[in-house]
């Protein structure tokens, strides 16, 4: 994938992080237009859908990571999720099917800006890695624990257990950008120093 | 196949713990599901008691929320209901039965409860 | 909690005769999204565990005859027996599946003539 320019300011850049990750905690931008589209909007559904939300590494997992590593499990996460997003825009309606049952196409349309957002995220990890490495202070790399593993759906018995696997999955990938969140709010203010 | 088998105690006294076993063959709980206990009264009533999660988490009636608890061993693949404080008014068929999310796809054959001294 | 009301309570019958029921939910069982109405049908014999008929209002469980159809959207719900057979003789239950706690109608009793 093609790599846009990075901004060589560590603040600049780590704003930009937060501001990314802040909007992809965002359920209203991916997770209950996914909701509404496949149907699954009724309480019942709801509530098995916030069930295990797969094998995402857990906050306190990322805590534990030095930044670069940190930077490096995100990366990989963020990878396996992209799959899985493809997969998911795959088995939605298509816009005309859409229109004909009366559904609000702007959900589909939320649902397909998902992955250039994360492609974005992905470009400024990528620089704030690159920013790290050349900073003074050097820093262990600790491999995240289920960094890359991609959250894996129990075998799905028809389309509608697929649609309820995607749910939980998304369900768990907010959570997921929750706690990124946090972490990276525990940054410093310069690439040398981490506020604990 | 899948399969749903309810055991335990005919005949229960007042004021005691009802409790009440599922033994499920040909499919794991922890897979997928919820997994459910339901109770029919003398008159056909039916009523939804609560569930189990595949992943443990679980749901109850509120009419029965304060009696009520449902839990399981993995190992065995099975669950359990418990319910307190019986009264007579709990003398009912009871049933498990497996919800794949859009209905109750898989039922045990129920066994019959009495509440009585 | 959704209260399911059914109608009748009894039915008499003839064998090859076509029936309808009805059930009426207190709320919605309609999903906003999809449009996919949230509720079941089950048959119940004497003696014997409910067993699933419809779901989703409409779709058939596998291995159900087609003789049975379920209809209805929102909160008015039919099933209808195209040409009854001694073997449907049962109790039929409607059932809310759309918000817990899950509820049922009290049945319908479908009796020979």
């Known amino acids: 994938a093609a790599i846009g320019s990075c901004s060589k300011e560590y603040r600049v850049l780590l704003g930009q992080l937060q501001k990314q990750t802040d909007l992809m905690q965002d359920t209203s931008r991916l997770l209950d237009p996914y909701i509404r589209i496949q149907g699954l909007d009724v309480p019942k559904l709801r509530e098995h859908c916030r069930e295990r939300p797969g094998a995402f590494p857990s906050e306190e997992t990322l805590r534990g990571l030095g930044r670069r590593g940190f930077l490096q499990t995100l990366n990989a996460t963020l990878g396996c999720v992209l799959h899985r997003l493809a997969d998911l825009e795959q088995r939605l309606p298509k816009a005309q099917d859409l229109e004909r049952s009366g559904l609000n196409i702007e959900d589909l349309e939320k649902l397909q800006m998902a992955r250039p957002n994360i492609l974005g995220l992905r470009n400024n990890i990528y620089c704030m890695a690159q920013l790290l490495d050349n900073s003074d202070t050097a820093e262990p790399t600790k491999a995240g624990r289920g960094a890359s593993q991609p959250p894996t759906p129990t075998p799905a018995s028809d389309a509608f257990q697929r649609k309820l696997e995607g749910c939980r999955f998304l369900h768990g990938y907010h959570r997921f950008m929750h706690s990124v969140g946090r972490v990276f709010s525990k940054w410093g203010e310069s690439p040398n120093r981490s506020r604990r | 196949e899948v399969q749903l088998q309810e055991s335990g105690p005919g005949l229960v006294k007042p004021s005691q713990s009802l409790s009440l076993t599922c033994t499920v063959t040909g499919y794991s709980i922890t897979s997928d599901y919820a997994w459910n206990w339901i109770r029919q009264f003398p008159g056909n009533k039916l009523e939804w008691m609560g569930y189990i999660s595949y992943s443990g988490s679980t749901s109850y009636n509120p009419s029965l929320k304060s009696r009520i608890s449902i839990t399981r061993d993995t190992s065995k693949n099975q669950f359990f209901l418990q319910l307190n404080s019986v009264t007579t008014e709990d003398t009912a068929t009871y049933y498990c039965a497996r919800d794949r999310y859009e209905a109750m796809d898989y039922w045990g054959q129920g066994t019959s409860v009495t509440v009585s001294s | 909690d959704i209260v399911m009301t059914q109608t009748p309570s009894s039915l008499s019958v003839s064998a090859g005769e076509k029936v309808t029921m009805s059930c009426k939910s207190s709320q919605s069982l309609l999903s906003s999204g999809n449009q996919k109405n949230y509720l079941a049908w089950y048959q119940q014999k004497p003696g014997q565990p409910p067993k699933l008929l419809i779901f989703g209002a409409s779709t058939r469980e596998s291995g159900v005859p087609d003789r049975f159809t379920g209809s209805g959207s929102g909160t008015d719900f039919t099933l209808t027996i195209s040409s009854v057979q001694a073997e449907d003789l049962a109790v039929y239950y409607c059932?809310?599946?759309?918000?817990?706690?899950?509820?049922f109608g009290a049945g319908t009793k479908l009796e020979l003539k």
């Open positions: 059932q809310n599946d759309h918000s817990y706690p899950l509820t």
